[in-house]
Interface confidence: medium
């Protein structure tokens, strides 16, 4: 599923991401935009043999199990395929664990490079939330 901007903002808010660990909803929508272009089925492979999955491009070396990443920790205790569902519950729950891990949203390279320090509220402007 490819979400609309406001559709995703509403879904993320429903799942409790607004101001989760101090990160406003705009941060999460911005991260999803530049990680996956709002596509729940996005997959991207990394040079270390791991793969990033879903709307928030969660990595198989640390957070989920795709059955083929050497040394996978699976800290979210889920199959990576669950992160590709049109229902973003699994991605959100795992993202909450990631953002609580110590580095905050710096764990997402796209957020660090494209969202951090910008007017992230622009990503939810005009949305009926």
């Amino acid at each position: 599923k490819v979400f609309g901007r406001c559709e995703l903002a509403a879904a993320m808010k429903r799942h409790g991401l607004d101001n989760y660990r101090g990160y406003s909803l705009g941060n999460w929508v911005c991260a999803a935009k530049f990680e996956s272009n709002f596509n729940t089925q996005a997959t991207n492979r990394n040079t270390d043999g791991s793969t990033d999955y879903g709307i928030l491009q969660i990595n198989s070396r640390w957070w989920c199990n795709d059955g083929r990443t050497p040394g996978s920790r699976n800290l979210c205790n889920i199959p990576c395929s669950a992160l590709l569902s049109s229902d973003i519950t699994a991605s959100v729950n795992c993202a909450k664990k990631i953002v609580s891990d110590g580095n905050g949203m710096n764990a997402w390279v796209a957020w660090r490079n494209r969202c951090k320090g910008t007017d992230v509220q622009a990503w939810i402007r005009g949305c009926r939330l």
Partner: antibody
Amino acid sequence: QVQLQESGAEVMKPGASVKISCKATGYTFTTYWIEWVKQRPGHGLEWIGEILPGSGSTYYNEKFKGKATFTADTSSNTAYMQLSSLTSEDSAVYYCARGDGFYYYWGQGTTLTVSS
Amino acid sequence: DIELTQSPATLSVTPGDSVSLSCRASQSISNNLHWYQQKPHESPRLLIKYASQRASGIPSRFSGSGSGTDFTLSINSVETEDFGMYFCQQSNSWPRTFGGGTKLEIK
């Protein structure tokens, strides 16, 4: 137990297309990548690409882009590979395998012969 | 693409001999190297995963070693059922690639 059952041998004319199937049993089909491998005598094993059935996400070896197309039907736990514009170079045994980085589980292979 | 070069192409041995098969990668692949055995008209069979881990059900006479670019599959006291083709495969990057194979034949 995990099993991958491929469709039977095919004899096709040059220029035609063929669709090979791989039915998976004994595990959660949507969770694992299905990979496709080509074997020709004297050419060893070649990785064609992969599909994650749960999402339909696909990756292709550049060499096989435009030649192979992967699909999956999660209702029947079956992955498919279509090969188009067949030539004699496509005559080979084609295997599906479960993608665990390594390949512990393989199909029995589908022999494709392209001949006029 | 990562190229895997296997040597020798053919190895003629007598049952009871011990042998080593080599697989060399064109760039470092850490331990992401796997070994397969294939008999005529059969699918490949996984022997060793991640350079040195024996797959389920594989006899202890098979062992693997190496890291980086140079890898070895060793068979201690070859048995008649061990004859066939042996392939290595890397999973360090895409596309996945295989070596050209080593044929283990009876002398």
